[in-house]
């Protein structure tokens, strides 16, 4: 995240960091709690990195140097990456990790609400995102989970200062025209929230940007509620029943 | 499966014009980003141009800036390579390719993916 | 302009034996923004690697590549008949996108 501060335990107690551990162990992606046994993330987190084994899921954490070999971690039963992701096109980036165990829910572990499916005309206006990622484009992985409100900017603003790319309707944008604001390496996957009638609701997963926080370049992030069926289908055809916290 | 066939090259004179089309299929044409790549004879690779997937943003290689346009047909999933004021230089063979645009760490990525076999250009007189 | 230096122009080598390829750039590249293709006689290039070290679809594993900011390797832990050939780095981070003159991997 850049230009962003410092979370608070229990503040955004859906986001988890996904790490792989292979010879050493780094995180590599943030993630977002949907249900007892269900993380919503990014697809290309995924790349090249396909096999569950090697990914350990930390939960209700702040500090990444707090984890220890003794910290309790989550590990993946199931992948599931959307069916028309395609690791050479930047459309449908959003996979399903379905855990081998339920977690229980803590006041610094529990889920986040999905929007309605297809929501369009709610307009919000206070949105923050969240993650460990880089704090410059040429940064590192920052050890306490950072916070930044940005505000979205309309799909037909993002298509003007990405012109090489498609803003599809499945997509949204937050940023400032000036920049100095924004998710960055090591945020993909991560929450993109909005508050709204007193709830948080899961708007958007860190995609895309052009660099970081950069003038007149917003972050572009997959729109969950454009993939509510896939999500409703795909949870409830692996559980037998929904276990997702509902949506507003 | 992806396939790329370029045609139009041949021999022409120093001065003359040459159109090269590159014809797609396999692929949503309408929605990638396509490139021309050329190598001289016994040379490297050298990049000619691009072109994003609606053809609104173009760029060039210096060394064909203002006498080469690219263009495309997304209706008929053809790419095109305008060349003018053709020089003894740019005798090569001329490749489309097609540029892949995916997310790698919150980035896009860039590469070319797919390539066609190719079609020889020579500016001879 | 980026300028892409690799080095050796020419790697003689006997199959088996590892081959390491080296690229170089003027300024610093975003490490997804860099490919490595390999182009054997009367072929069109074939992309091998992308992103510095992803392999690209059906390429095998004795392919690997790394590297970050200026300097970037390509290794052929264990060269095969069909790996001879000559092999382009390239950069897409800023336009012009530019190539490598190529290394020329020949049979020892």
């Known amino acids: 995240i850049v230009g962003g501060t410092n979370s608070s335990w229990g503040e955004w107690p859906w986001q988890v960091s996904l790490q792989v551990k292979l010879t050493a162990q780094r995180h590599l992606c943030g993630g977002s709690l949907i249900g007892h046994q269900w993380v919503l993330t990014a697809a290309h987190c995924f790349d090249g990195l396909p096999l569950q084994d090697v990914w350990r899921i930390y939960s209700g954490i702040l500090n990444l140097s707090d984890i220890t070999k003794d910290t309790p971690f989550s590990q993946i039963k199931e992948i599931i990456i959307h069916q028309n992701y395609k690791v050479s096109e930047g459309n449908h980036d959003i996979a399903l990790i379905k855990l081998q165990a339920p977690l229980n829910y803590t006041e610094f572990q529990k889920p986040i609400c999905l929007p309605s499916k297809g929501d369009t005309s709610t307009i919000y206006t206070n949105c923050w995102v969240t993650g460990w990622g880089f704090s410059k484009e040429k940064g590192e992985i920052q050890n306490i989970l950072q916070k930044v409100n940005i505000p979205l900017v309309t799909n037909e603003e993002c298509q003007k200062r990405y012109q090489d790319y498609k803003i599809t309707q499945r997509m949204v944008c937050a940023g400032y025209k000036e920049g100095g604001k924004d998710a960055c390496k090591g945020d993909s996957g991560g929450p993109l929230v909005c508050k709204h009638n007193g709830m948080w609701r899961l708007v958007g997963i860190t995609s895309w940007g052009e660099g970081c926080a950069r003038r007149e370049q917003p972050g572009v992030y997959t729109k969950v509620a454009e993939y509510m069926d896939w999500i409703l289908e795909k949870t409830q055809s692996s559980d037998g029943k929904a276990q997702m916290q509902s949506p507003a | 499966e992806v396939q790329l066939l370029e045609s139009g090259g041949g021999l022409v004179q120093p001065g003359g014009s040459l159109r090269l089309s590159c014809a797609a299929s396999?692929?949503?044409?309408?929605?990638?980003?396509m490139v021309w790549v050329r190598q001289a004879p016994g040379k490297g690779l050298e990049w000619v141009s691009y072109?994003?997937?609606?053809?609104?943003?173009?760029y060039y290689a210096d060394s064909v800036k203002g006498r080469f346009t690219i263009s495309r047909d997304n209706s008929k999933n053809t790419l095109y390579l305008q060349m003018n004021s053709l020089r003894a230089e740019d005798t090569a063979v001329y490749y489309c390719?097609?540029?892949?645009?995916?997310?790698?760490?919150?980035?896009?990525?860039?590469?070319?993916?797919?390539w066609g076999q190719g079609t020889l250009v020579t500016v001879s007189s | 302009d980026i300028q892409m230096t690799q080095s050796p122009g020419t790697l003689s080598l006997s199959p088996g034996e590892r081959a390491t390829l080296s690229c170089r750039t003027s300024q610093f590249v975003n490490s997804n923004y860099l490919a490595w293709y390999q182009q054997t006689p009367g072929q069109a290039p074939r992309l091998l690697i992308y992103?510095?070290?992803s392999r690209a679809t059906g390429i095998p594993d004795r392919f690997s590549g790394t590297g970050y900011g200026t300097d970037f390797t390509l290794t052929i832990s264990r060269l095969e008949p069909e790996d001879y050939g000559t092999y382009y780095c390239q950069q897409s981070s800023r336009t012009p996108w530019t190539f490598g003159q190529g290394t020329r991997v020949e049979i020892k």
């Open positions: 396999g692929f949503t044409f309408s929605s990638q980003q």
């Open positions: 072109i994003s997937p609606s053809g609104g943003n173009t």
């Open positions: 992103g510095a070290s």
């Open positions: 390719a097609r540029v892949a645009r995916g997310i790698a760490a919150r980035s896009r990525t860039s590469y070319f993916d797919y």
